[in-house]
Every structure is written in C-alpha cells, then in structure tokens.
Interface confidence: medium
C-alpha cells in the first residue's frame, strides 16, 4: 500500500464495569476493540469501512493501560494500511466490546456486548507527529493517538509518489522527502541514468558510459574529442570533419601536397561570380545577387524568399514578383487585413485576441505552429542541420537527419571509413575520399582495388620527372606521378608558372 493509518490505544477506563445497555459485566468487562476507518462523512453511517477495519484481542478488564506492542497478537499501535492517495479527511469509529469467549479471537465468540463507541470525523495531513485525543461518555473514557504515515518508498502530501532509491543501469539516485529524485554525483537526466561526461567533452563527437569519461567517436581525437582526425597523409591541409583533407590556399591534390591555382586553371564560377582559391575544394564562388549554387549556376526565383504573407501565393514576374492575396488580406505582401476575430482568422487551433477595440486581431499559436495566423508548421529543418548532404525530416516535435551512405551521427557529421573494410588487395594502401575509397597499388598491381596483376610495372621505366613519386593503379594509364613542390604536369615535367597543356594525372 501507499500509506498506513496508525491508531495507538493508550488507556481505557470503565470503573463500574458497565455495558452500553446499562447491565454490568460478570465478573468484569473483558474488553476488545473494533476499529472502522472510512471516507469522511458529515454524519457517520453504517456501511463498509472503505479505508479498512481491524479488531484487537482482549486487551484488559474494565479499566486498563494499553502498552505498545510491535508484533504478534494485540499489536499496538494498530495498523490500517491503504493503497490509494490519502485524501486528507476521514471518519473513524472505535467500539469497545465485552466478550465472554476467547481472549485471542473475541470477534468469533457469540454473546459479545457493546460497552461504548466513539466517532471522530475530520481532516488529517500525512506526517510523523501523533495527534492525541481523549473521549468521555457517562460510563467510559478512552485515551488514544493517531497519525497517517507513508509506506516505505512512498512520499508526498498524499503518499502518492513512489520512489525507490537505486544505483544500477536504470538509474543512480536517492529520494528527496517529497519523493523527487536526487541524482548521485556524476549522473543527470530525468531518471539520473545519463552520466555527466568529463567537463568540456564535445556533445556530438564524444560520449561516456560512466561519469568523468570522454570517449571519442571515430574520426575524433583529443582529451575532449574536439579535434578531427584528417585523412592519412594530409600535408598542407586541415579538417573540419573527420578524414577530410581541406587544402590550405594554393595547395591541391589527394594529400594537399600539390601547389595549384584552381581558379585560373578551371574557371569554375559562372554568371560573373568571383572565384577565390580557398575552401575545401580549392576554390569558392561568391555569387552576384540573383544567383546561387556551388558555381553560381542557378538563377534565384524572386519568390524564393517567400515574400507573400498570410497565405498569399507568389508568382514570379520579369524583375519582380506578384502576391495574390486570399480573401480578407491586401497590400503588396498581403500584409494588411480587414479581418477581426469574428472571421476566425487563426488556424491550427490558434486563439484569437481582439486589438484596437476589435478593429484588428492577433493570433496566439499552439506549440509547433507559427505565423501571423498560425498557418505555418514550425520547420526544424530550416537551419539545415544535416551535414554531408544528409536529408532533414520533421518528425512531430523533433527532427532527424537521414544520412547519405558513408556518413552517420545525429547530424551526419561522422564519416564511416570505407577503408575499414580493407578493400585494397595485394597490400595496396587505402585512402578515404569523398566519392569512395581509392587504392594506391604496390609495384606489379593495378585496378581500382589493386586486383589486376600487371605483367610489366608501369613505374619501372621511371616515367616521373624532377624526383616525383610514381604510383600505379590509380588511372587508365596505370601510373600517377605525385609531384614535389614547384612542379606540375602528368609527369611533373613543368615548373610552376608554365601552364601544362594537359591534365596532371596520366
């Protein structure tokens, strides 16, 4: 149960040994008690003891003091357990009876006679303190105390709050006097089941299974897991996400070890945009107004900024746009309204409040809706939270990212290493690149996965100039020259400054 009503009988006085009907007990009144506890009644009536009932064995004859007894027959205080929320009010009927029969089980004896009874009605808060009382009638007097306490693991003003302290997989907490959880040091969360990681441990890139720990997810390093691991062999580059090799300005190639000026050689930026030799691909396009896209190749719709309010529909015009307003709204952007609350302008359960003596209105929106008429569902994807081309999906009150193959994490920020599956045969070296793994093959092997044994070694003839390193298996011609600083060209034959007439990879 959730609590216990306790009644302590202290003293019963019946000096003349009389029954309620005026007769006397022979040889004396062998007294036991019947207790009935029920819901509050302004006038106590017969009927079931809705909160419980209990009987005592014979406790004495005529007048006697009742001693405390913790176990067995004749336990005092008497216990009336209940398993509901204590309402704070009650009715109590205490009857004293005489039995000629069995001391231990007087209830079962025939010929029992009522000596006296008392009825108490009132309010009683849960608490440790006993309330003491004494009731007299013409023949008898009863002294007693009572209280309501919560059972073990129950708390609160009405013993309705269950809390059992624990320190295991499901939670690490103790219970407060009001039944709320008090987390043990190092734990947090509603149920104190989340460890508090090492102070400063990166929220996404680190985690812990016990307090003061910081375990890095793949691709991250450092005491606080806030440093990404660049891809192996990255020389003049950095990473902002794991396994990346974002080249410093003026550097290119797989390992950012080739000096190049991408903007001049490739002119990637369209529609009059400005190209600068920076960014993860070696260049960045700064678009003129009205254009967007990685290469400024996309013309922007004039309606892209959603200029029409209050559900107006936008139509592109040659150098502008036109808002077609719904009934009740007007103005260039449908920003003005003739509506009042009488027109029910608030959608999705929004509440309408009149303003300016009822000549205008304002909508108070429920959670998950916004806009002047509560017409827009709150879109948690507008901030583009998903990295690496992940697709954002609104799911009720939250959002999730659906990651592209090769990426994982809450925001698709973690790169799943393609090299973890060891795709390169014959001792080839694996490199994680954006479009999948690339194998650098040892002499005598070629193919995407170094699976082809070649009869002649394309590097054997020494095709690379100026001290360049030769690799096989990376291109149709079966060799690639990795140029030293200051040289470019398919065989590293050109000093920087003399533009080659063909690409660098043979």
């Amino acid at each position: 149960g959730s609590g216990i009503f306790q009644l302590r009988l202290q003293e019963f006085v019946n000096q003349r040994g009389m029954l309620a009907n005026g007769q006397s007990c022979e040889p004396g009144c062998r007294t036991f008690f019947r207790i009935c506890l029920k819901h509050f009644q302004a006038t106590f009536s017969e009927g079931p003891c809705t909160f419980g009932n209990v009987s005592t064995p014979v406790l004495g004859t005529n007048s006697f003091v009742v001693r405390d007894k913790n176990s067995g027959s004749g336990r005092n205080p008497l216990q009336l357990p209940f398993n509901f929320t204590w309402p704070g009010t009650f009715s109590l009927n205490i009857q004293a009876w005489h039995t000629p029969g069995d001391d231990l089980r007087p209830e079962t004896s025939p010929g029992n006679s009522l000596i006296s009874q008392i009825i108490i009605q009132g309010s009683l808060a849960v608490g440790k303190i006993w309330r003491t009382d004494e009731q007299n009638d013409t023949l008898t007097r009863l002294s007693y105390s009572y209280r309501v306490i919560c059972s073990d693991n129950y708390y609160g003003e009405s013993c309705s709050r269950l809390c059992k302290k624990r320190d295991d997989h499901f939670g690490h907490y103790e219970c407060q006097p009001d039944g709320s959880l008090s987390c043990l040091p190092g734990w947090t969360g509603k149920y104190c089941d989340q460890p508090i990681c090492l102070s400063g441990c990166h929220e996404q890139n680190g985690y812990c299974s016990k307090p003061d720990e910081c375990i890095c997810r793949p691709g991250w390093q450092g005491r606080l897991c806030n440093e990404c691991i660049p891809h192996n062999g990255c020389r003049h580059g950095t990473c902002s996400i794991p396994w990346q090799c974002a080249c410093d300005e003026g550097w290119g190639g797989l390992f950012c070890d080739q000096d190049l000026n991408y903007c001049t050689h490739h002119s990637p930026c369209k529609n009059g945009s400005t190209c600068s030799n920076s960014g993860p691909k070696g260049y960045t396009c700064t678009c003129l107004p009205g254009y967007t896209g990685e290469h400024c190749e996309l013309g922007l719709s004039k309606c892209a900024s959603n200029p029409c309010r209050n559900g107006g529909s936008c139509k592109d015009q040659e150098n502008s746009y036109h808002c077609l307003c719904p009934p009740g709204y007007y103005g260039q952007h449908c920003e003005h309204s003739t509506l009042t609350c009488a027109d029910s302008p608030c959608f999705n359960g929004g509440s309408c409040r009149e303003r300016n003596q009822g000549s205008s209105y304002a909508c108070e929106c429920p959670p998950n809706f916004t806009g002047s008429n509560c017409e827009k569902k709150v879109d948690r994807c507008t901030s583009n939270p998903c990295a690496n081309g992940g697709q954002c999906q609104n799911r009720g009150p939250s959002r999730t990212c659906r990651c592209r193959p090769g990426f994982t994490g809450t925001h698709c920020e973690l790169h799943i290493s393609d090299c973890a599956r060891s795709p390169c045969a014959h001792g080839g070296t694996c490199h994680d690149l954006e479009n999948g793994p690339v194998c650098t093959c040892p002499a005598g092997f070629s193919g995407r996965r170094c699976e082809v044994r070649i009869t002649h070694d394309a590097c054997a003839s020494g095709p690379c100039f100026n001290g360049a390193t030769c690799y096989t298996g990376l291109s149709p011609n079966n060799f690639v020259c990795n140029c030293p600083y200051g040289f470019v060209g398919s065989r590293c034959e050109f000093p920087v400054g003399l533009p080659p007439s063909f690409p660098w990879v043979a």
Epitope: P326, P327, T338, L339, T340, D343, F347
Partner: nanobody
Framework: EVQLVESGGGLVQAGGSLRLSCAAA????????MGWYRQAPGKQRELVAH???????YYADSVKGRFTISRDNAKNTMYLQMNSLKPEDTAVYYC??????????WGQGTQVTVSS
Amino acid sequence: EVQLVESGGGLVQAGGSLRLSCAAAGSTFSSYVMGWYRQAPGKQRELVAHISTRGITYYADSVKGRFTISRDNAKNTMYLQMNSLKPEDTAVYYCNTRRNFLSNYWGQGTQVTVSS
C-alpha cells in the same frame, strides 16, 4: 467541401453596368470571408474586392468608387455591382473563399467583356 458558382457576366459597353453573383453551397456561408478576383488575358490573377463575415469591405485601387461588394447570408450569395465599366475591366471574374490555409475554394469563373 464548398461549391461556388458565378453568374451575371456578359458583354457590355464602356460606361455600362453589370451585377455578378456567387452562390455558395456546402457549408455555413456566414462564417466565410469571401472575395472577387479577376484574370485578364496574359496577366496575373488579381484581387478585386473582399468582404468579411461582419461585412467589412476592401477594394483594389483600380475599382474603388465604381464597384460594390455585398453579401446576403440568408441566400448564401455574394454580389459584385460593377458600374462605369471600362475596357480594362475585361477579364474572367472568379469568386473565392478560404476556410484555412489548405482549403482554398474557387468558382469556375464568369467572363466580363467591356467594349469601347
């Protein structure tokens, strides 16, 4: 579902008058904000006038003082009285109502032609 049916269009000389009607069926008409729109050939559809449930009206600048919008809730009908018509008023006239941002109801339209 709300059905809207326009009537009253036709051919009229410049300076003449026409009265368009829009009959609504299928729901409590009195609780709807109603509007008249028009679309001339090769042009965007535009708002002409609208009337709220309490009879508060709005008119586009181009028709102010010439057109009058009204409604008869007992007959579930909205009207557009068009006076001093001009050739530039030639268009297909549509009536529209909207119960929420997803339920936007249009009539099939009625042709108004003003000859000079």
